[in-house]
């Protein structure tokens, strides 16, 4: 007996479409080896029509496909348009040649059944309105109309002219006339529901004068799509469910069975094992809408349907869409921290992989939001400007060719903490999730940047210091000016550097930036850092402002600016860095569900390039001492 | 609730033919697929026959290894109905024939794991 294990008969009609499923031992080499469809001949020579090396056979093109779950150890042959010839022997199976492992299947494609000569056929999906057309003489004009559904022998009675509705159709059937009609009332059924399916007949008139029409009507199941996405991707549902619903709530919910539980609805309701990694987006005013779901795990697959209704909730008998999500283990998405914890006051470095091939794509960092939908406003982005609120602590760092870049974010309160996305505006699947949680600090950050006050008077020279631990000896410490397009390095001095790592004295490894001669476009944010190679660490933020030296006010209270750094309160008082209110137009790109938005918050930020920069470190003269 | 129940067991000569019958009932059966297990005295469960149809006209039969084109599983023209004809019958068919259904999307229709509904079972027993 073969190990491999499929339906032995598939019958259907002409037209239609048949999904076979095979199912193989759950092994390395079975997971990996070709899989094949093949029909089997007079001669015993198995032909093959499709297999998973590629191959797809001249009357299967444009028609036929064939899918492996390795992770079910079973593969589908989707075969569509079905036509009489098609019926035949077939084998599905597993190996090099067509003798391997395999299972037989018979296949029969009939003619499309014949129902009574009148009978007009109704296919409509779970959820909609049908419309019966029942015509009748000009003799039955005056007589009761009716429609009765066929149960065996008996036709029970659905619906007449002296407003009978049978209980199970109440609020669904209606029968009517339109305009000056006089041979022709229809039924309208709505809310669909499977066992609707059937045989009617409708008929005006009694006895033998009346006239009858039969209707069969077919009520399908909605055919789920096939999605296959790998481990730590994304996923988008998109789904369009008619205007007929479009005032209505809109939901989407994974079966567990029998029930179908809500991932997300636009009331607001939420699963927290998405927390964070979701987004519902209306698309027009048609009811369209998607839902993206960012950094896909192995339990996240399963079958899903995205449904409308007043409750937000799924109810028998309202359209649906739906779709079986694959998640494939074997990803070519890095793993990568999904949690990074900060303390207040101090900073995180997070590193965002993006398809190494798209180096050139650009890169967002934004921070999801749980309104109703989920949102998530774009922070920063490489040609995108920082969001306000943002300046001087935060700062993208792209590292082409390595498949990554990193964003910094510094004087951290405990309002940063929640859940942000990487993202680029190329390959959708390359969005990463990222839950940041900051603590209350309880020591001293390792940074420390003298003199704290800093204000630096024009003409003259000025020196910041940064203090770090003996544990940062090894690594690169840098100095970097902060504007709108990142953090630009300056040349700096590091004293710590002369002295033997093993003598390290705690109290002198200082890294120290000079300016000289100080200018009026050397007020702003300045950043101390530590980094190895591509991999940034701790930074700390001080705010230097630049004052005349005859008058005494600086343009910023720097004790203020520099208070945020050091005890991070919740109010934002910065006026540094104002820009025109034009550019405040690209900070909220919406809802990021997909790259055409993407695309357009790039297009937007690089409209806004010329007028949004705040001045960069081209103006910047370090001098070592 | 859902409730399936078996009919058509009994004693039968070996060569003989038997048709056993499932009735599902209840408003929530919506299942679109139906599956016999038999089970011996003293043996584990074992898969007999499955039924999973779309609203399309079409259908896949799925079979046991031993039915070797004995056993017929069909669905009746009363969608809630599911048939198993066997012919042929064997001394070694003899056991407690139980038809099943699921809440709703089935894995390997082989495994009992894959069903929700279960009937009481009827008795086929097959002299020499």
């Known amino acids: 007996q073969s190990p491999i294990f499929g339906p032995q008969d598939v019958s259907s009609i002409e037209g239609n479409s048949v999904s076979i499923t095979c199912y193989y031992p759950d092994t390395s080499v079975n997971r990996h080896t070709r899989k094949y469809w093949c029909r089997q001949g007079a001669n015993g020579y198995c032909a093959t029509l499709i297999s998973s090396n590629g191959y797809l056979s001249k009357e299967y093109s444009g028609r036929a496909s064939l899918i492996n779950f390795p992770e079910n150890s079973t593969f589908v042959i989707n075969i569509a348009h079905l036509t009489q010839e098609d019926t035949g022997s077939y084998k599905c199976g597993l190996g090099t040649t067509n003798r391997g492992l395999f299972f037989d299947v018979s296949l029969e494609v009939s003619q499309v059944p014949e129902f009574p000569n009148d009978t007009h056929v109704y296919t409509k999906d779970i959820g909609r309105t049908v419309t019966i057309e029942c015509r009748f003489k000009e003799g039955n004009a005056h007589s009761k109309k009716s429609l009765c559904k066929k149960r065996g022998e008996a036709c029970e009675v659905v619906i007449d002219s002296t407003e009978y509705v049978d209980p199970s159709y109440k609020d669904r059937a209606i029968l009517f006339m339109k305009g000056t009609s006089r041979d022709i009332f229809y039924v309208n059924i709505s809310h669909l529901i499977p066992s609707d399916a059937g045989l009617y007949v409708c008929q005006a008139g009694e006895g033998p004068s009346a006239d009858k029409n039969n209707a069969d009507l077919q009520v399908l199941e909605p055919e789920p799509e096939l999605l296959y996405k790998d481990l730590r991707s994304s996923v988008t549902f998109e789904c369009d469910l008619g205007r007929e619903v479009a005032n209505d709530a809109k939901y989407l919910c994974r079966k567990n069975k029998e029930t179908c539980d809500v991932i997300i609805n636009t009331l607001g309701k939420r699963d927290p094992a998405f927390e964070g990694r979701i987004l519902l987006t209306p698309r027009d005013d048609n009811g369209r809408f998607s839902v993206l779901i960012t950094g896909l795990r192995k339990e996240d697959a399963g079958h899903y349907q995205c449904g409308a209704h007043s409750s937000g909730l799924p109810q028998e008998g309202w359209p649906v869409q739906a779709w079986q999500l694959f998640v494939n283990e074997e990803s070519t998405i890095p793993n990568s921290r999904s949690v990074v914890k900060g303390v207040t006051g101090g900073s995180v470095a997070i590193v965002c992989p993006y398809n190494p091939k798209e180096s050139s794509s650009l890169k967002y960092w934004c921070h999801w939001e749980a309104d109703e939908n989920g949102r998530c406003p774009v922070l920063v982005g490489t040609q995108a400007l920082v969001q306000e609120g943002y300046e001087g602590r935060l700062a993208l760092f792209d590292q082409p060719g390595s498949g990554a870049y990193t964003v910094i974010l510094n004087q951290l309160t405990t309002q940063d903490s929640g859940f942000y996305w990487c993202l680029t505006d190329g390959d959708s699947r390359w969005r990463t999730t990222i839950e940041l949680q900051v603590a209350e600090a309880t020591k001293k950050p390792d940074l420390e940047v003298t003199p704290q006050n800093a204000t630096a008077v024009i003409g003259e020279t000025f020196t910041i210091s940064c203090h770090y631990p003996c544990k940062f000896y090894s690594q690169e410490k840098y100095w970097c000016k902060w504007s709108n397009d990142g953090c630009h390095i300056l040349p700096s001095h590091d004293e710590g550097a002369r002295q033997s790592s093993v003598s390290c004295d705690q109290s002198s490894q200082i890294v120290s930036m000079t300016l000289n001669p100080v200018k009026k476009e050397d007020e702003g944010w300045y950043w101390c850092g530590v980094k190895e190679g591509q991999v940034y660490g701790e930074t700390t933020a001080i705010y230097v402002a630049v004052e005349e030296r005859t008058r005494g006010s600086p343009h910023i209270n720097p004790t203020d600016a520099n208070a945020r750094a050091k005890d991070a309160p919740e109010e934002e008082a910065m006026e540094s860095s104002v820009r025109e209110d034009e550019n405040k137009a690209n900070l909220d790109p919406r809802l990021f569900a997909d790259e055409r938005e993407i695309q357009n918050a790039g297009d937007q930020a690089q409209e806004n390039r010329a007028s949004g920069n705040a001045g960069s470190a081209g103006g910047q003269s370090g001098s070592s001492k | 609730e859902v409730q399936l129940v078996e009919s058509g067991g009994g004693l039968v000569q070996a060569g003989g033919s038997l048709r056993l019958s499932c009735a599902a009932s209840g408003r929530t059966f919506s299942s679109d697929a139906v599956g016999w297990f038999r089970q011996a005295p003293g043996k584990e469960r074992e898969f007999v026959a499955h039924?999973?149809?779309?609203?399309?006209?079409?259908?896949?039969?799925y079979y046991g290894d031993f039915v070797k084109g004995r056993f017929t599983i069909s669905r009746g023209t009363a969608k809630n109905t599911v048939y198993l004809q066997m012919n042929s019958l064997k001394p070694e068919d003899t056991a407690v024939y139980y038809c099943a259904a699921p809440k709703g999307a089935i894995g390997d229709p082989r495994s009992t794991r894959e069903y929700d509904y279960w009937g009481q079972g009827t008795l086929v027993t097959v002299s020499s």
């Open positions: 039924i999973h149809w779309s609203g399309d006209f079409t259908t896949y039969y």
